[in-house]
């Protein structure tokens, strides 16, 4: 069995989680990728997916989650912006390869989000004044919804597609460095 390892990210509310999931370039470059949360005593939930087939360095935004798949580097970049305490939990990157079972990418991500320091705004010496601007994106066929033997690679019906706000843009301030601590189960 694959040894499950965790990488711990400790961040404050309002900051951004920025992780990179590596994958085998030749095998999975155009495969659809997903970001899942695994909560104790719950079924996992797929929160967001890249398009199908996955487009190179094309940002897909679902709520506060932004996925970017860099084919030439063999990595999926996942950002969760404006973090909230309730975002704390265990996450993982997944590659869909129908009709085979999804391929889980390790390490899993243990995200711990705590309340920011009280006091003067901007007094945190670690904070940097970063602003992310995500270009407006319309995303189709975000996650595999209906797969049958005849339509494994077919996009789901139009009515089930997620469409982001046409003029959506995310501006972030006070994005601090990420603390990465490997944790082994």
């Amino acid at each position: 069995a694959t040894k499950l390892t965790e990488e711990k990210y400790e961040l404050k509310e309002g900051q951004t989680l920025d992780v990179k999931c590596d994958y085998t370039l030749e095998k999975f470059a155009s495969s659809q990728k997903a970001w899942q949360i695994i909560r104790d005593g719950e079924m996992p939930k797929t929160l967001a997916c890249t398009e199908r087939p996955s487009k190179n360095s094309h940002p897909v935004q679902v709520g506060r989650i932004i996925l970017e798949d860099y084919h030439d580097h063999g990595l999926l970049r996942v950002r969760m912006v404006n973090l909230q305490v309730e975002d704390s939990g265990l996450y993982q990157c997944v590659i869909y390869q129908p009709p085979k079972e999804p391929h889980m990418l390790f390490d899993r991500i243990r995200l711990v989000v705590t309340k920011g320091f009280s006091g003067t705004p901007g007094s945190n010496e670690n904070s940097t004044q970063n602003v992310y601007k995500i270009p407006p994106t319309t995303t189709k066929a975000l996650c595999p919804l209906y797969t049958s033997p005849r339509t494994v690679t077919q996009a789901p019906p139009k009515s089930t597609a997620d469409v982001s706000t046409p003029d959506s843009e995310i501006n972030l301030t006070n994005v601090t460095d990420i603390i990465r601590v490997p944790v082994f189960n």
């Epitope: 899942q36 719950e42 079924m43 679902v62 049958s148 494994v152």
Partner: antibody, heavy 122, light 113 residues
């Protein structure tokens, strides 16, 4: 066209066992989480159990925990519910239902079987 | 457990009129990270299994008439039938699949006035 067909219901005495089956067709069964939901006569819907697409995750309602077991055979496109130590309050129509999205991309259950009636009575 | 409370228990509406059903969850069913509410609406006609109408609180399932719409976020949700048709007579249920155990509202019976 997706079809879910339940079978195995019937009349059984309290304390006895019953095994329900749900045969699926028209979908890649092994990609979907599956649920059992029941409905007592004239009552509302009650979730019973869920199993993940690969069988690795299983969860139960407190009312059936320790008595019912959900399982699946992806090679046969079939979902099962083993019901032991049956009680009168387990009397209901039992439905199997498929999650709308594959691989945990779920909200809502898109396809339901017609149901099979389980009557627990002495 | 998340308790789902539906109101009213029953509703009589004239053909062509609007029907509104409310559903309240005892805690939020919104995943704020992906901005999705894990709430669905079902229609059940006598002797039939439930049929999915709305998922993620406001997205209509494929093939469902556009007179059905869902709205709300967090803990308060509404199913609206904009112009009631005879074939809409049924019991309607809300359901959360945000967290286990998954729970349903008690149902709202919609009839023709």
């Amino acid at each position: 066209q997706v079809q879910l067909v339940e079978s195995g219901g019937g009349v059984v005495q309290p304390g006895r066992s019953l095994r329900l089956s749900c045969a699926a067709s028209g979908l890649t069964f092994s990609s979907y989480g599956m649920h059992w939901v029941r409905q007592a006569p004239g009552k509302g819907l009650e979730w019973v159990a869920v199993i993940s697409y690969d069988g690795s995750n299983k969860y139960y309602a407190d009312s059936v925990k320790g008595r019912f077991t959900i399982s699946r055979d992806n090679s046969k496109n079939t979902l099962y519910l083993q019901m032991n130590s049956l009680r009168a309050e387990d009397t209901a129509v039992y439905y199997c239902a498929r999650e709308r999205g594959t691989y945990y991309y779920a909200s809502g259950w898109a396809n339901w079987g017609q149901g099979t009636l389980v009557t627990v009575s002495s | 457990d998340i308790v789902m409370t539906q109101s009213p228990d029953s509703l009589a509406v004239s053909l062509g009129e609007r029907a509104t059903i409310n559903c309240k969850s005892s805690q939020s069913v919104l995943f704020s990270s992906n901005n999705k509410n894990y709430l669905a609406w079902y229609q059940q006609k006598p002797g039939q299994p439930p049929k999915l109408l709305i998922y993620w609180a406001s997205t209509r399932e494929s093939g469902v008439p556009d007179r059905f719409s869902g709205s709300g976020s967090g803990t308060d949700f509404t199913l609206t039938i904009s112009s009631l048709q005879a074939e809409d007579v049924a019991v309607y249920y809300c359901q959360q699949d945000f967290s286990l155990p998954y729970t349903f509202g008690g149902g709202t019976k919609v009839e023709i006035k």
